[in-house]
């Protein structure tokens, strides 16, 4: 068998909401993956498990099952969303994310993803992890790959 390549592209969008009383931030983060099948037979993307960390603390998890089948020598782009919560011992972040004196409230999140593929009863897992900048101050859509670099982060409204 030839390789199945998984490439984490980046954050596609981040939608934010707050609970003022609880000083809690809710971020729905949609990420994009490219999965390439270099084989001459189809492979099934059985599941994608993802988690997001902030300051070494897991703030969100997601799992997608029975996602798609990728044909021979084909590539598919897959979006997945991880709901995250920044609260409790990290509730000081509410002050940062709601500061009116700054335009872009970038925080650094560690995106971790594991893709499980199957073919002919054989299962394979591929994992990736990447630090990404996300604006916790407003709803943001990003050009693909943009969220990896702070100096180009001009969020599109």
């Amino acid at each position: 068998p030839r390789s199945i390549d998984v490439k984490y592209i980046g954050v596609k969008s981040a939608y934010v909401s707050y609970d003022v009383q609880k000083r809690t931030i809710y971020l729905n983060i949609t990420n994009t993956l490219n999965i390439t099948n270099n084989n001459y037979y189809s492979v099934e993307v059985e599941n994608i498990t993802a988690q997001v960390q902030f300051s070494k603390t897991v703030i969100g998890k997601a799992r997608l099952n029975n996602i798609t089948i990728i044909g021979p020598l084909d590539m598919k782009q897959i979006d997945y969303t991880v709901p995250t919560v920044i609260a409790e011992e990290m509730s000081y972040m509410y002050d940062f994310c709601t500061l009116i004196s700054i335009k872009v409230h970038n925080i650094v999140l560690m995106m971790q993803v594991t893709v499980t593929t199957t073919y002919f009863g054989h299962s394979e897992q591929i994992s990736q992890e990447r630090y990404q900048y996300v604006d916790c101050g407003r709803n943001t859509t990003y050009q693909l790959g943009q969220s990896e670099y702070l100096n180009v982060l001009q969020p599109q409204q």
Partner: antibody, heavy 117, light 107 residues
């Protein structure tokens, strides 16, 4: 307004211990970690450790493990730094500060510790 | 531990001049960097947090920039109250460490 009030200067003998305080006011005490720094005269700053009143989580710089102990009195919103087995190397100004994302935004006025026989 | 290398160590400048202080981290600190100003006998004061954001009450002549391992603090049109020592500090992973400081003196 946010304030961190530190206890007064200390003159202590070698081998003894000293306990200094940092009283927080003007904000919800359990929300922000409190950091402690050491500054030798005319030198840069060294991070000793931090204490998060939300869950009593304490982190220390390896260099200060066994030397520094952080404790809390939540009823008075006060964090304490105790230094043990003092030597002349411990003579310095000790600062507490409030942690914020990407910086320490409020600082106490500092506590001067002089170790001398 | 992450090392913070700050330069220059000292600087002699006149009022009205522009100054840039740089800080290099031994590894990527993902913009988790603060800049502080300290006057003799006083506590440090936060100027810039998260590499680029001006703290409350800090004049707009101060600005922070950088990413990855390279960061800088720029002071436009220096005022007499700006003299003193400047420190950078990373807050990426404990132990937080400070740069060695830049002493700004009046020429």
């Amino acid at each position: 307004q946010v304030q961190l009030q530190q206890s007064g200067a200390e003159l202590v003998k070698p081998g003894a211990s000293v306990k200094m305080s940092c009283k927080a006011s003007g904000y919800t005490f359990t929300t922000f970690p409190i950091e402690w720094m050491k500054q030798n005269h005319g030198k840069s700053l060294e991070w000793i450790g931090n204490f998060h009143p939300y869950n009593d989580d304490t982190k220390y710089n390896e260099k200060f493990k066994g030397k520094a102990t952080l404790t809390v009195e939540k009823s008075s919103s006060t964090v304490y730094l105790e230094l043990s087995r003092l030597t002349s190397d411990d003579s310095a100004v000790y600062y507490c500060a409030r942690y914020f994302y990407g910086g320490m935004d409020y600082w106490g006025q500092g506590t001067s510790v002089t170790v001398s026989s | 531990d992450i090392q913070m290398t700050q330069s220059p160590a000292s600087l002699s400048v006149s009022v009205g001049e522009t100054v840039t202080i740089t800080c290099r981290a031994s590894e990527n600190i993902y913009s988790s960097l603060g800049w502080y100003h300290q006057k003799q006998g006083k506590s440090p004061q936060l100027l810039v947090f998260a590499a680029t954001n001006l703290a409350d009450g800090v004049p707009s002549r101060f600005s922070g920039s950088g990413s990855g391992t390279q960061y800088s603090l720029k002071i436009n049109s220096l005022q007499s109250e700006d003299f003193g020592t400047y420190y950078c500090q990373h807050l990426w992973s404990v132990p937080w460490t400070f740069g060695g400081g830049t002493k700004l003196e009046i020429k």
